[in-house]
């Protein structure tokens, strides 16, 4: 990440704690699902790749008054060092496949799920 | 509720470093940034930096690379800012605070502050 | 750097007055995602710095709302409708829009 009058660095690789709490509360989120989620609210689908929490961030802040993943989302900010907001868009987005959250986190949670087990932390 | 307590003050020779940390309780520490500010004697306020906590990558004022690295460690909920080759421009208070992503970044919690001097 | 000048540098008033504190910064500052960072702080002397107003004009919780944010653009200000003992101190705009954030220079708000 870089930015103009600024510098951004990716710092070191952090220990697990972060990433293990935001597996916990993704799952926490898919167990106790009874009605839909957020009223089966659409978000952009993303690349699960590089760059992946500010993009799952600028996805999911697009939902609002949704209790059930306000944790999720400020957990997301601490993982994404630049400001996000609603109506942001990101080349991280896949531009033309909406989902539903439910969904969303479930993909997400699979992800981070693999990368906790290969030891990619960052 | 939510609590930053730093470090106490420090007493530094120049050229030598130091490592003040910001210690958070109360509130879930990864889910915040954390920024650093500096304050010298009867001055104004000059932004540092930030750190995502939960990935540990950090915006900087350029002004202050090479000067300060900022650092967390998750499983104590604690930020450190290591300040280098330090001089009498150094000398300063400098404070943590936290953003919210919920209150557009704003900084919503601080710490007491340390105070840094450098002197011979 | 966004260059934030603040005016007055100091400002005397009478407990119950108005006060009025400008801060123009020296480009936008509003972000590319839309938002305008500019918040407003308070600090007294020996104190850490506390929040007062975020995104130009929302209050922090526990804040009176004799406090009040306004601008866009470059031009903000911060008003104090009845001024209060324990309002005296230096109050502080920031912009959080452009890296790397920056602070006015201060205002100090002191009984005349």
């Known amino acids: 990440l870089t930015c103009l009058g600024g510098f951004a660095s990716p710092g070191p690789v952090p220990p697990s704690t972060a990433l293990r709490e935001l597996i916990e509360e993704l799952v926490n989120i898919t167990q106790n699902q009874k009605a839909p989620l957020c009223n089966g609210s659409m978000v952009w689908s993303i690349n699960l790749t590089a760059g992946m929490y500010c993009a799952a961030l600028e996805s999911l802040i697009n939902v609002s008054g949704c209790s059930a993943i306000e944790k999720t989302q400020r957990m997301l900010s601490g993982f994404c060092p630049h400001k996000v907001s609603a109506g942001q868009f990101s080349s991280l987005h896949v531009r033309d496949t909406k989902i539903e959250v439910a969904q969303f986190v479930k993909d997400l949670l699979l992800h981070l799920k693999k990368l906790f087990r290969e030891g990619q932390f960052n | 509720q939510v609590q930053l307590q730093q470090s106490g003050d420090d007493l530094v020779l120049p050229g030598a470093s130091v490592k003040l940390s910001c210690k958070a309780s109360?509130?879930?520490?990864?889910?915040?940034?954390i920024n650093w500010i500096k304050q010298r004697p009867g001055q104004g306020l000059e932004w540092i930096g930030h750190i995502a906590p939960g990935s540990g990558s950090t915006y900087f004022n350029e002004m202050f690379k090479g000067k300060a690295t900022l650092t967390v460690d998750t499983s104590s909920s604690t930020a450190y800012i290591q300040l280098s080759s330090l001089s009498s421009e150094d000398s300063a208070v400098y404070f943590c605070?936290?953003?919210?992503?919920?209150?557009?970044?704003?900084?919503?919690?601080w710490g007491q502050g340390t105070s840094v001097t450098v002197s011979s | 750097d966004v260059l934030m000048t603040q005016t007055p540098l100091s400002l005397p008033v009478s407990l119950g007055d108005q006060a009025s504190i400008s801060c123009r910064s020296s480009?936008?500052?509003?972000?590319?995602?839309?938002?305008?960072?500019l918040q407003w702080y308070l600090q007294k002397p020996g104190q850490s710095p506390k929040l007062l107003i975020y995104?130009?004009?929302n209050r922090f919780s526990g804040v009176p709302d004799r406090f009040s944010g306004s601008g866009s653009g470059t031009d903000f200000t911060l008003k104090i409708s009845r001024v209060e003992a324990e309002d005296l101190g230096v109050y502080y705009c920031?912009?959080?829009?452009?890296?790397?954030?920056?602070f006015g220079g201060g205002t100090k708000l002191e009984i005349k």
């Open positions: 109360g509130y879930t520490f990864t889910s915040y940034w």
């Open positions: 995104k130009v004009s």
């Open positions: 605070a936290r953003s919210d992503i919920f209150l557009s970044y704003a900084m919503d919690y």
């Open positions: 920031f912009q959080g829009s452009h890296v790397p954030y920056t």
């Open positions: 480009q936008s500052i509003v972000h590319s995602n839309g938002n305008t960072y």
